[in-house]
């Protein structure tokens, strides 16, 4: 067990041009507080994760009101630390996430208001015990600068603060496989901490804050037997001993979940989901107030003052759940016209737009009809990203500007000769054919194929196309 | 409560200008994108105009392209419609509407009630 | 421009009827399409967004079909409140275009 410790030194405009405007105005005082989100490891599932370190409120900062045309300065800022309470090891590796919100205390209808200023975001090695880190990071135009540290609370000691150490019972030594504490040579290493509530007869650990069951035993903290009468059921393991073991009640029978949670039945054990307003393993801890911090991913509590009132998380958009923890997938709703690629950045979505669309949500089709003229009386036609001119006779091109020639696509059937006219083509028909495309035989009597040759016209001569 | 009230409507001689504003309301003004829509007498709605949260992204509608100018100041909770060169098929209801959240649908969740737009000699 | 065409313009029905409004666009606007109701007074509400999805505080006799260029609006069984004039909405590509509208009158 142990606390984290951050201490912000100085929220403002960040270095370089383009100074933020100040967030706070004569109209619309401000003032400023900062809640942190703590969550274990480095790997990308951390970033999706709820805050599983933990997570805590600062005091709002001192009121603060713009000097009218003076730049943003650093803005007055909370007394004290942000302190994140963890149970377990500290985890060396952590990611965090630290929100500036800006509070209103305007003549807002319904209490003040609340937005956020800033979200900056890092992962970080650190070892509990060690000195403060010192760290700048930026959001936009605005720069935060903090310290922060993990330290451990007595009894643990060490890096991950697993090590419990005791005053010794004896001047000479500590007792049978415990080491002294270095650097307090005067304490020795206490027997391990299993989870609270693990059954010390069927329980035992070799991790703090685990608990791993005899055979026999089952449940989160080994206090479920197993029996071993039949092999129908599908639950449980199978063991080498007995061929199979089936829990008499399962995870979920007779409900551990307290205070009107839902059990839902994990790999391992169970899994409580907790009204508002509890927490824990099977929401039997209560009490839950917005001074605990409980929503996560930048959501907002309201009300919750005191441990009888619930409270409620307002989630910001991609975010759900009673207590913020669920992370929307905003890509799924296809939010990118146009066969846009969908990015969701977390603070931000993004499309990467096809060729032709362009706009947020590539919803500007740049290649449409509006204002383009299709020359030569050729009409356009749009869709699909791309605009095209249906040209008229004789003009081709991607705006009809260029004259086509009438010959290119070989028109003249049967050996026909092809002939560009003002109004379109002719078909100079080789002996034995004739029509406007050479396309019908001549029989040898002298009468033709239907449709029958125009007055006045003999077969073989050229016929114009129009 | 979301609110939008539009402002500045008013009858004016074509050729002639006109500034519509719509005052917000209710909500972060500054994480939304605003609509202008119209309706002339006894017809439809017609979108004008568009402008994204940050007022980043403007977008308009071809009959007024050129003449009309959105705008907006968040600091004020304010949206603008500057109308300029106004023609007798201007004459409409205007409203401001607003968007949705990082206008994922581009729908237009919320609407003032209207300010009347008449252009005539 | 995407042409949304609307039917009926007009129809007359009773409290308690199922009505359905259908919208269709001259090319797929992929569900981005939403509908409207405007009282006589002026007022513009929201319903509907893509497609079926109900705007809150909307009630849910009314819901929302369809895709590619065809899409309904259907009132279960029909309230007092609800007569009004609908359109429907792309907003799927520049310029976001409405349907002519359709009028729900008392039989």
């Known amino acids: 067990a142990g606390v984290f410790e951050l201490q912000i030194h100085s929220f403002g405009p960040g270095p370089g041009p383009g100074a933020p405007r100040s967030p706070c105005s004569a109209r619309l005082p401000c003032r400023l507080f900062f809640r942190v989100c703590l969550k274990p490891g480095l790997s990308e599932e951390a970033a999706e994760s709820p805050c599983a370190l933990g997570a805590a409120l600062s005091a709002r900062g001192p009121v603060y009101t713009e000097q009218p045309g003076a730049p943003a300065p650093d803005l007055p800022l909370p007394d004290g630390l942000l302190q994140v309470p963890f149970r377990d090891a500290w985890p060396g590796t952590f990611s965090f996430i630290i929100e500036t919100w800006r509070e209103e205390l305007g003549d807002q209808i319904g209490g003040p208001a609340w937005s956020l200023l800033a979200r900056v975001a890092g992962r970080r090695r650190l070892a509990a015990g060690g000195p403060w880190a010192r760290d700048i990071q930026r959001a936009g135009a605005w720069e935060l600068r903090f310290s922060y540290r993990a330290r451990c609370e007595p009894p643990a000691v060490g890096t991950a603060c697993t090590r419990l150490c005791r005053p010794r019972s004896a001047p000479s030594r500590c007792g049978p496989g415990l080491r002294p504490c270095a650097p307090l040579e005067d304490e020795c290493e206490a027997p391990l901490v299993c989870r609270a509530g693990c059954s010390p007869e069927h329980g035992f650990c070799e991790q703090p804050g685990e608990c791993r069951c005899l055979e026999g035993w089952t449940g989160p903290l080994c206090t479920v037997p197993v029996s071993t009468s039949s092999c129908l059921s599908p639950r449980g393991p199978s063991s080498a001993t007995t061929g199979c073991l089936v829990p008499g009640p399962g995870p979920c029978d007779g409900n551990p979940c307290a205070n009107g949670g839902s059990c839902s039945e994990t790999p391992r054990s169970f899994e409580c989901t907790c009204p508002r307003g509890f927490y824990g393993l099977r929401c039997e801890v209560s009490g839950v107030t917005c001074a605990d911090g409980p929503c996560f991913n930048g959501g907002l509590c309201v009300g919750g003052a005191d441990p009888d009132s619930a409270y409620i998380c307002h989630c910001p958009p991609g975010f759900q759940g009673s207590n913020c923890e669920k992370r929307v997938d905003r890509c799924s709703l296809q939010p990118c016209r146009n066969g846009g690629l969908c990015l969701d950045l977390g603070h931000a979505l993004r499309c990467r737009c096809r060729a032709g669309f362009a706009g947020p949500r590539c919803e500007h089709d740049l290649d449409d009809c509006a204002g383009r003229a299709c020359a030569n009386g050729g009409t356009c036609v749009e869709g699909g990203g791309a605009h095209r001119c249906s040209c008229a006779l004789g003009f081709g091109g991607r705006d009809c500007r260029e004259r086509a020639d009438p010959c290119a696509a070989r028109p003249c059937a049967h050996g026909g000769r092809c002939y560009a006219h003002f109004s379109g083509l002719v078909c100079a028909c080789a002996p034995g054919y004739m029509g406007a495309r050479c396309e019908f035989p001549v029989h040898p009597d002298g009468a033709s194929a239907l449709p029958a040759a125009p007055p006045g016209l003999r077969p073989g001569d050229p016929q114009r196309y129009l | 409560e979301v609110q939008l009230v539009e402002s500045g409507g008013g009858l004016v001689q074509p050729g002639g200008s006109l500034r519509l504003s719509c005052a917000a309301s209710?909500?972060?003004?500054?994480?939304?994108?605003i609509h202008w829509v119209r309706q002339a007498p006894g017809k439809g709605l017609e979108w004008v105009a568009y402008?994204?949260?940050?007022?980043?992204?403007?977008y308009y509608a071809d009959t007024v392209k050129g003449r009309f100018t959105i705008s907006r100041d968040n600091a004020k909770n304010s949206l603008y419609l500057q109308m300029n060169s106004l023609r007798a098929e201007d004459t409409a209801v205007y409203y401001c509407?607003?968007?949705?959240?990082?206008?994922?649908?581009?729908?237009?969740?919320?609407w003032g009630q209207g300010t009347t737009v008449t252009v005539s000699s | 421009d995407i042409q949304m065409t609307q039917s009926p313009s007009s129809l007359s029905a009773s409290v308690g009827d199922r009505v359905t409004i259908t919208c269709r666009a001259s090319?797929?606007?992929?569900?981005?399409l939403n509908w409207y109701q405007q009282k006589p007074g002026g007022a513009v509400k929201l319903l509907i967004y893509y497609t079926s999805r109900l705007h809150s505080g909307v009630p849910s006799r009314f819901s929302g079909s369809g895709s590619g260029t065809d899409y309904t609006l259907t009132i279960s069984s029909l309230q007092p409140e609800d007569f009004a004039t609908y359109y429907c909405q792309q907003g799927n590509t520049l310029p976001w275009t409405f349907g002519g509208g359709t009028k729900v009158e008392i039989k």
């Open positions: 402008i994204s949260s940050g007022g980043y992204t403007i």
């Open positions: 209710g909500f972060t003004f500054s994480d939304y994108g």
């Open positions: 509407a607003r968007g949705d959240y990082e206008d994922i649908f581009y729908t237009m969740d919320y």
């Open positions: 090319r797929d606007i992929t569900k981005f």
